[in-house]
C-alpha cells in the first residue's frame, strides 16, 4: 500500500525520495510520474534526471533538494485538488531487474479559510521507504533554458528553508534511504 502525504490547495506539496550515490557525482537516473509505478519507467513522467542533471520536467514539478547528493524529493508547486493521487518515484539502478520503486499517495485538502496567510510553508511531512528509476533520454530533451516561470529567488529560498529545516534532517536521519554500491 502507498504511504500517504498531505497538502492543502495552494500550497507546495513535498514527496520525499532519497538514495545514496555510490560515490560523489556517481548519479543514478531517477524519474517521477503521476500514477502508480508500473513495471518499467514512471507512468506519465513529470520529471526525470540522468547521470548528470535534471533533463526533463513539466510545469510546477521540480526538485528542491540537492539531487547530486541523492535527494530527489519532488516538490509540486501550488497544488490543486486535481493533483491528488498516486505518484511514482523510481531509481533505476543499472543491472538485471535492479530498479527500486515506491508509490506515494498525495491527498490534497481544501484550503483552510484563515484571515491572514502566514509565512509558514506546509511541506508534507512523512517519509516512505524508497523509490527508484532509470532511463536514458532522447536527443531532444529539454534544457535548463526552458524552465517554467518560477521565481529563482523563491526557489533558492525554498531550497534553503528545506535544507535547513529539522524536517529535512529528520528525514535524512530516518535510515529510509537506498544505498547504491
Amino acid at each position: 500500500s502507498e504511504v500517504e502525504y498531505r497538502a492543502e490547495v495552494g500550497q507546495n506539496a513535498y514527496l520525499p525520495c532519497f538514495y545514496t550515490p555510490a560515490a560523489p557525482g556517481n548519479l543514478v537516473p531517477v524519474c517521477w510520474g503521476k500514477g502508480a509505478c508500473p513495471v518499467f519507467e514512471c507512468g506519465n513522467v513529470v520529471l526525470r534526471t540522468d547521470e548528470r542533471d535534471v533533463n526533463y520536467w513539466t510545469s510546477r514539478y521540480w526538485l528542491n533538494g540537492d539531487f547530486r547528493k541523492g535527494d530527489v524529493s519532488l516538490t509540486i508547486e501550488n497544488v490543486t485538488l486535481a493533483d491528488s493521487g498516486i505518484y511514482c518515484c523510481r531509481i533505476q539502478i543499472p543491472g538485471i531487474m535492479n530498479d527500486e520503486k515506491f508509490n506515494l499517495k498525495l491527498v490534497i485538502k481544501p484550503a483552510k479559510v484563515t484571515p491572514a496567510p502566514t509565512r509558514q510553508r506546509d511541506f508534507t511531512a512523512a517519509f516512505p521507504r524508497m523509490l527508484t528509476t532509470r532511463g536514458h533520454g532522447p536527443a531532444e530533451t529539454q534544457t535548463l533554458g526552458s524552465l517554467p516561470d518560477i521565481n529563482l529567488t523563491q526557489i533558492s529560498t525554498l531550497a534553503n528553508e528545506l535544507r535547513d529545516s529539522r524536517l529535512a534532517n529528520d528525514l535524512r536521519d530516518s535510515g529510509a534511504t537506498i544505498r547504491i554500491g
Epitope: 500514477g35 508500473p38 513495471v39 518499467f40 507512468g43 513522467v45 536514458h136 532522447p138
Partner: antibody, heavy 122, light 107 residues
Framework: EVKLVESGGGLVQPGGSLRLSCAAS????????MAWVRQAPGKGLEWVAN????????YYLDSLKSRFTISRDNAKNSLYLQMNSLKAEDTAVYYC???????????????WGQGTLVTVSS | DIQMTQSPSSLSASVGDRVTITCRAS??????LAWYQQKPGKSPQLLVY???TLAEGVPSRFSGSGSGTDFTLTISSLQPEDFATYYC?????????FGQGTKLEIK
C-alpha cells in the same frame, strides 16, 4: 512507418545456442524500451525479456534469465536475444516488440515484428 | 507473479453482435492493462493500452474499461475481420504476464 524485422531463427539441437536479431526502423530507437515475446506452437503469448533505452537495465522471465541475454545496439537500431542451453520447450515464434517510450504514458506493445521461428529438436 | 485470467476461453458470435471479453488480475494492476488481437499466422496487434485508450488506427467499435483487478474489452458490433484470438496483458508487475487468450469464432 514503424518496422521491426526479426532474423536468426532456425533449427537447433537441445543444448545449442542461437542469437536472434531485430532490425528497427521508422522511429527513434533509443527512445524506447524494447522487448522479446514468444509464442509456442498453438499456445498463448509469453513475455521473455525487456531492455531499457541504453541497455543498462534488463528484465527477464525468471526461468530464462540464466540462459537468455537481451541486448541492444542503438547505433545500429538493433535488438538482440542471445539464447544458450536451448531446450525443446523453448520452441516458439519469437517476436520483437516496441514497449514504453521515454515519457512513459503508453503501456503496451505498440508494434511487433513478424516473428522468427526457433525450433529446438534433435 | 500476477496471474491474468480471461473469460470466456472461447466464444461464438455473429456479425453485428455486441461482445464482451473479461480479464481479471490476481493483484491490483491499476490501469496498466493492454488488449491485443491476433489472427492465425500473424503477429499480435495492440488494440487498447492503459485499460481504456484506443491504440492508433483501431476502429471505434473496440473499447476497453476497468481498473484495479477487473477489465473488459467490448466490441460493439462485430465485423467479419474481428474473428480472432484476444489477449490481455499487464504492465504493472514483473514478469509481464498475458491472459490465456479468448478465441472469438463465427457462430
Amino acid at each position: 512507418e514503424v518496422k521491426l524485422v526479426e532474423s536468426g531463427g532456425g533449427l537447433v539441437q537441445p543444448g545449442g545456442s542461437l542469437r536472434l536479431s531485430c532490425a528497427a526502423s521508422g522511429f527513434t530507437f533509443s527512445d524506447y524500451y524494447m522487448a522479446w515475446v514468444r509464442q509456442a506452437p498453438g499456445k498463448g503469448l509469453e513475455w521473455v525479456a525487456n531492455i531499457n533505452y541504453d541497455g543498462s537495465s534488463t528484465y527477464y522471465l525468471d526461468s530464462l534469465k540464466s540462459r537468455f541475454t537481451i541486448s541492444r545496439d542503438n547505433a545500429k537500431n538493433s535488438l538482440y536475444l542471445q539464447m544458450n542451453s536451448l531446450k525443446a520447450e523453448d520452441t516458439a515464434v519469437y517476436y520483437c516488440a516496441r514497449d514504453v517510450g521515454y515519457y512513459g504514458g503508453n503501456y503496451g506493445f505498440a508494434y511487433w515484428g513478424q516473428g522468427t521461428l526457433v525450433t529446438v529438436s534433435s | 507473479d500476477i496471474q491474468m485470467t480471461q473469460s470466456p476461453s472461447s466464444l461464438s458470435a455473429s456479425v453485428g453482435d455486441r461482445v464482451t471479453i473479461t480479464c481479471r488480475a490476481s493483484d491490483n494492476i491499476y490501469s496498466y492493462l493492454a488488449w491485443y488481437q491476433q489472427k492465425p499466422g500473424k503477429s499480435p496487434q495492440l488494440l487498447v493500452y492503459n485499460a481504456k485508450t484506443l491504440a492508433e488506427g483501431v476502429p471505434s467499435r473496440f473499447s476497453g474499461s476497468g481498473s484495479g483487478t477487473d477489465f473488459t474489452l467490448t466490441i460493439s458490433s462485430l465485423q467479419p475481420e474481428d474473428f480472432a484470438t484476444y489477449y490481455c496483458q499487464q504492465h504493472y508487475g514483473s514478469p509481464l504476464t498475458f491472459g490465456q487468450g479468448t478465441k472469438l469464432e463465427i457462430k
